[in-house]
């Protein structure tokens, strides 16, 4: 199933996707698309690029962020709604016969909290490390928040807590 | 106006080639996905290739896998779909079909075919 | 691959009549689900996509419905020009594929 990235509405939600170019800046159109990966191309394109720079949007909300030349193609959804909630596709479009890499992303849209004049701790807590999703039998999914997270004492999780929050970046579940 | 017109068919013996086009105009070229479909006597639609936008990727249908090649030549606005090897049973009517504006594996115009015949 | 099965294979049917037709998925493929009309010597024509959405310039009178393995194209009310083959094609698997057809003719 799809790995699940939770943003909040008008925040920025993140969609990672990624290439390797092969040779280094050697780049092949992609494709993001709201829905799954169809046989070929994408439904309901939002953006496209090809071997050079973005040269499809759909709307001014859709943005390639990273560095689009070393094959990082992860889609930002500027100002989130509820109706940007679903699956979608990435599709790294390989040269060759059905060469494609195909990588399907759920977004889930969540209101914001509710804001409380002194947030607690496990309210902060929460926000910088979301509660483990259950997924049927297999119990707890793994939880990641982006990047990696070292060691931190109480203060350092209260100023990440309030970056993220301040960033609108998107925490993943898998 | 949107215009598909398909060139290229004729009669041709078992094992030979030919080669059909597609000259497109009326919108833009580049963006779509586009596919090759055809309908053989009494028969319904069945699907036999397609190629991406840029015209890196491309997609066969197994029956025609390693004998037909599809490309593209977005400067003329025309596909192309090379036969070889050809079977009384690739005998079809074959039109060309532009993808959705907006992605998705469906099509939204075709041309009005062009009628290959396989015999001896 | 995906089989579409479609029923029944002739619609007898009267103009200002109802039309119903269906297509079966041997397996689900979500909503990536087409319909076209096709008259003899001319090009298929797409009347829906996604299962429910009307391409541009089909009448009102067309509508499909269904999402997984079971679809349903409707015409409210058969003109004399509705009279024709219709086919289903599914976009969620590869490879692509349509079903039999559906010939609606003049009762």
């Known amino acids: 199933s799809e790995v699940e990235y939770i943003a909040e509405v008008g925040q920025n939600a993140y969609l990672p996707c990624s290439y390797t170019p092969a040779p280094p800046g050697n780049l092949v159109p992609v494709c993001w698309g709201k829905g799954a990966c169809p046989v070929f191309d994408c439904s309901n394109v939002v953006l496209r690029t090809d071997n050079r720079d973005v040269n499809d949007r759909t709307s001014g909300r859709y943005w390639l962020k990273g560095d689009f030349h070393k094959g990082d193609v992860s889609l930002t959804i500027e100002n989130v709604t509820l109706a940007d909630s679903g699956v979608y596709c990435c599709r790294i479009q390989i040269p060759g016969i059905m060469n494609d890499e195909k990588h399907n992303v759920k977004l889930v849209v969540i209101k914001p909290a509710k804001v409380t004049p002194a947030p607690t701790l496990q309210r902060d807590l929460t926000s910088a490390f979301p509660r483990m999703l259950t997924t049927g039998e297999h119990g707890p999914a793994e939880t990641q928040t982006p990047g990696s997270l070292p060691d931190v004492n109480l203060t350092q999780i209260f100023t990440l807590t309030n970056e993220l929050r301040d960033s609108g970046a998107t925490i993943r579940t898998a | 106006e949107v215009q598909l017109v398909e060139s290229g068919g004729g009669l041709v013996q078992p094992g030979g080639s030919l080669r059909l086009s597609c000259a497109a105009s009326g919108f833009t070229f580049r963006q779509n996905a586009w596919s090759w479909v055809r309908r053989a006597p009494g028969k319904g639609l069945e699907w036999v290739s397609a190629?991406?936008?840029?015209?890196?990727?491309?997609y066969y249908a197994d029956s025609v896998k390693g004998r037909f090649t599809i490309s593209r030549d977005n400067s003329k606005n025309t596909l192309y779909l090379q036969m070889n090897s050809l079977r009384a049973e690739d005998t079809a009517v074959y039109y060309c079909?532009?993808?959705?504006?907006?992605?998705?594996?469906?099509?939204?115009?075709w041309g009005q075919g062009t009628l290959v015949t396989v015999s001896s | 691959e995906i089989v579409l099965t479609q029923s029944p294979a002739t619609l007898s049917l009267s103009p200002g009549e109802r039309a119903t037709l269906s297509c079966r998925a041997s397996q689900s493929v979500s909503s990536y689900l087409a319909w076209y009309q096709q008259k003899p010597g001319q090009a298929p024509r797409l009347l829906i996509y996604?299962?429910?959405n009307r391409a541009t310039g089909i009448p009102a009178s067309f509508s499909g419905s269904g999402s997984g393995t079971d679809f349903t194209l409707t015409i409210s009310r058969l003109e004399p020009e509705d009279f024709a083959v219709y086919y289903c094609?599914?976009?969620?698997?590869?490879?692509?594929?349509f079903g039999g057809g559906t010939k609606v003719e003049i009762k």
């Open positions: 996604d299962a429910s």
């Open positions: 094609q599914q976009y969620g698997s590869s490879p692509l594929t």
């Open positions: 079909a532009k993808g959705g504006d907006y992605g998705g594996n469906y099509f939204d115009y």
């Open positions: 190629i991406s936008g840029s015209g890196g990727s491309t």
